[in-house]
């Protein structure tokens, strides 16, 4: 006859307030004859949690029908868990005896602890935008979890990051803990459409981690490149000059034309297009009247992007004598 073993498979059981906890206990033998009782704690002061004979355990139910012959499952469910229910629970086999049953064997115990889920991670980026090739910091915070053990990972576009520092507070015993992590991310020019993800895994989440995200579009500034070109073809007595502002982000942009240092107030035609990487292109056309022009016309396209210092590109207008003649001819 095999010796009876009391199997309590979970060493630790994490439960949430208000939920139902299942405490597992199975026996490997029907002998010796006698009941299985549940206690919290050990020694003379242990608390009886369940005895199938007594009817005053309103929150406790059995998983199996204990009255069935050959039943070997003595698992119980405790409903409406409160903080007062924490402790170590033992299923204990008694050998039938007279005048009293004799304790025969105890299970190893299952520690019931209150688990609290972490709050949804909140990811905050830098206060000011930064240009590519620079490093920016993102912080991730989650609160109110228990127990203290928690895993936090950072990702950029699905690739795990390694440059981060994480703290869990407090360091001592507490009913709930908080985590704060700071990741350093090097910005790439194409990061307008990138995301950083903070992923938090905790035992209460049953393998389904929580994620917080931040868009790098909030942290990056891609400065524009400027190119000013003169169109070869002339329209009547006007020459078309183009200022192409390429690959900038965010969209906030002011463009002004100057002619020989004088800001031109007149309307200019322009188009804005979005690139696949999320940056923008801006094209502005400026028509220069050449019928009465001197030879040394300098056009300047000046761009002020996202409140930064203005950048400009100059173009010395090339007007051939032939062009002048044509324009003179065209003038009434």
């Amino acid at each position: 006859e095999e010796e009876l073993q009391m199997i309590q498979p979970e060493k630790l059981l994490l439960v949430t307030v208000g939920k139902t906890a299942t405490l597992h206990c199975t026996v490997t033998s029907l002998l010796p004859v006698g009941p299985v009782l549940w206690f919290r704690g050990v020694g003379p002061g242990r608390e009886l949690i369940y005895n199938q004979k007594e009817g005053h355990f309103p929150r406790v139910t059995t998983v199996s029908d204990l009255t069935k012959r050959n039943n070997m499952d003595f698992s119980i469910r405790i409903s409406s868990i409160t903080p007062a229910d924490v402790g170590t629970y033992y299923c204990v086999k008694f050998r039938k005896g007279s005048p009293e049953n004799v304790e025969f064997k105890s299970g190893p115990g299952t520690e019931m602890a209150l688990g609290a889920k972490p709050s949804a991670p909140v990811v905050l980026g830098p206060a000011a935008r930064t240009t590519p090739e620079h490093t920016v910091s993102f912080t991730c915070e989650s609160h109110g979890f228990s127990p203290r053990d928690i895993t936090l990972k950072w990702f950029k576009n699905g690739n795990e990051l390694s440059d981060f520092q994480t703290n869990v507070d407090p360091t001592g015993q507490s009913v709930a803990y908080s985590i704060r992590s700071t990741a350093r991310v090097v910005l790439d020019p194409w990061d307008v459409r990138s995301q950083v993800i903070c992923e938090v895994a905790h035992v209460t989440l049953q393998g389904d981690p929580l994620r917080g995200t931040a868009n790098l579009s909030e942290a990056i500034r891609v400065p524009p490149t400027l190119e000013v070109t003169q169109q070869p073809m002339r329209v009547g007595n006007q020459v078309n000059v183009t200022c192409q502002v390429r690959k900038f982000y965010p969209q906030s942009l002011q463009l002004t034309w100057s002619e020989n240092g004088n800001v031109c107030q007149r309307e200019t035609a322009s188009t804005l297009t979005e690139n696949k990487d999320g940056t923008y292109n801006w094209t502005s056309w400026f028509l220069v009247n050449i019928s009465d022009q001197r030879d040394d016309v300098v056009l300047t396209c000046q761009v002020k992007h996202d409140g930064q210092l203005a950048v400009s590109k100059r173009l010395a207008l090339e007007v051939t004598v032939h062009q002048k003649d044509q324009s003179s001819d065209a003038t009434p």
Partner: antibody
Framework: EVQLQQSGTELVRSGASVKLSCTTS????????MHWVKQRPEQGLEWIGW????????EYAPKFQGKATMTADTSSNTAYLQLSSLTSEDTAVYYC????????????WGQGTSVTVSS | DVVMPQTPLSLPVSLGDQASISCRSS???????????LHWYLQKPGQSPKLLIY???NRFSGVPDRFSGSGSGTDFTLKISRVEAEDLGVYFC?????????FGAGTKLELK
């Protein structure tokens, strides 16, 4: 629900024997000691003895040694009490009860079987 | 055998009264395991006895808290704080520390 159902009233002649039954439900009879108690009309309670259905072990009060025989059938969850050589002194209500070593007491009782011995 | 003298044999009460029943044993009821197997049962007319108090002072499942047991060694008491109509009947003390198990003669709780 725990229940102990005892057999019906018995009217027997002096010198004869009678076998009373006690069928349990709501628990496995092997988990308990089954006790038998005698109560004569308008009198107190007298313990007859117990049987452990698990292995058939018995213990009798000296007074009932030779008078009472306790047996049990675990397959039908039934305990039996046989009384032999009946006399008017054996006229009584006989109770079976399930003794649970958790309480250390007779916690569940049958409704009793009335035995009347006539001459 | 352990003798269990129980007093009084009859106890007339009014509803709402406190009632007290005494049970003495001819020898100590403390078992070698340290427990005392002294119990109280109530038998109502036409019914089988029902367990009220086990091991001196523990109320059995479903027993109202107006019932309390106390005592040690050889001297034991059952108290009913406020008698109700459903409490009327015969109260027996019983011991099973020693074999054979023995009962007190019973106390009849009845209305005055």
């Amino acid at each position: 629900e725990v229940q102990l159902q005892q057999s019906g009233t018995e009217l027997v002649r002096s010198g004869a024997s009678v076998k009373l039954s006690c069928t349990t439900s709501g628990f496995n009879i092997k988990d308990y000691y089954m006790h038998w108690v005698k109560q004569r009309p308008e009198q107190g309670l007298e313990w007859i003895g117990w049987i452990d259905p698990e292995n058939g072990d018995t213990e009798y009060a000296p007074k009932f040694q030779g008078k009472a025989t306790m047996t049990a059938d675990t397959s039908s969850n039934t305990a039996y009490l046989q009384l032999s050589s009946l006399t008017s002194e054996d006229t009584a209500v006989y109770y079976c009860n399930a003794y649970d070593g958790y309480y250390g007491a007779m916690d569940y009782w049958g409704q009793g079987t009335s035995v009347t011995v006539s001459s | 055998d352990v003798v269990m003298p129980q007093t009084p044999l009859s106890l007339p009460v009014s509803l709402g009264d406190q009632a007290s029943i005494s049970c003495r044993s001819s020898q100590s009821l403390v078992h070698s395991n340290g427990n005392t197997y002294l119990h109280w049962y109530l038998q109502k007319p036409g019914q089988s006895p029902k367990l009220l108090i086990y091991k001196v002072s523990n109320r059995f499942s479903g027993v109202p808290d107006r019932f309390s047991g106390s005592g040690s060694g050889t001297d034991f008491t059952l108290k009913i704080s406020r008698v109700e109509a459903e409490d009327l009947g015969v109260y027996f003390c019983s011991q099973n520390t020693h074999v054979p198990l023995t009962f007190g003669a019973g106390t009849k709780l009845e209305l005055k």
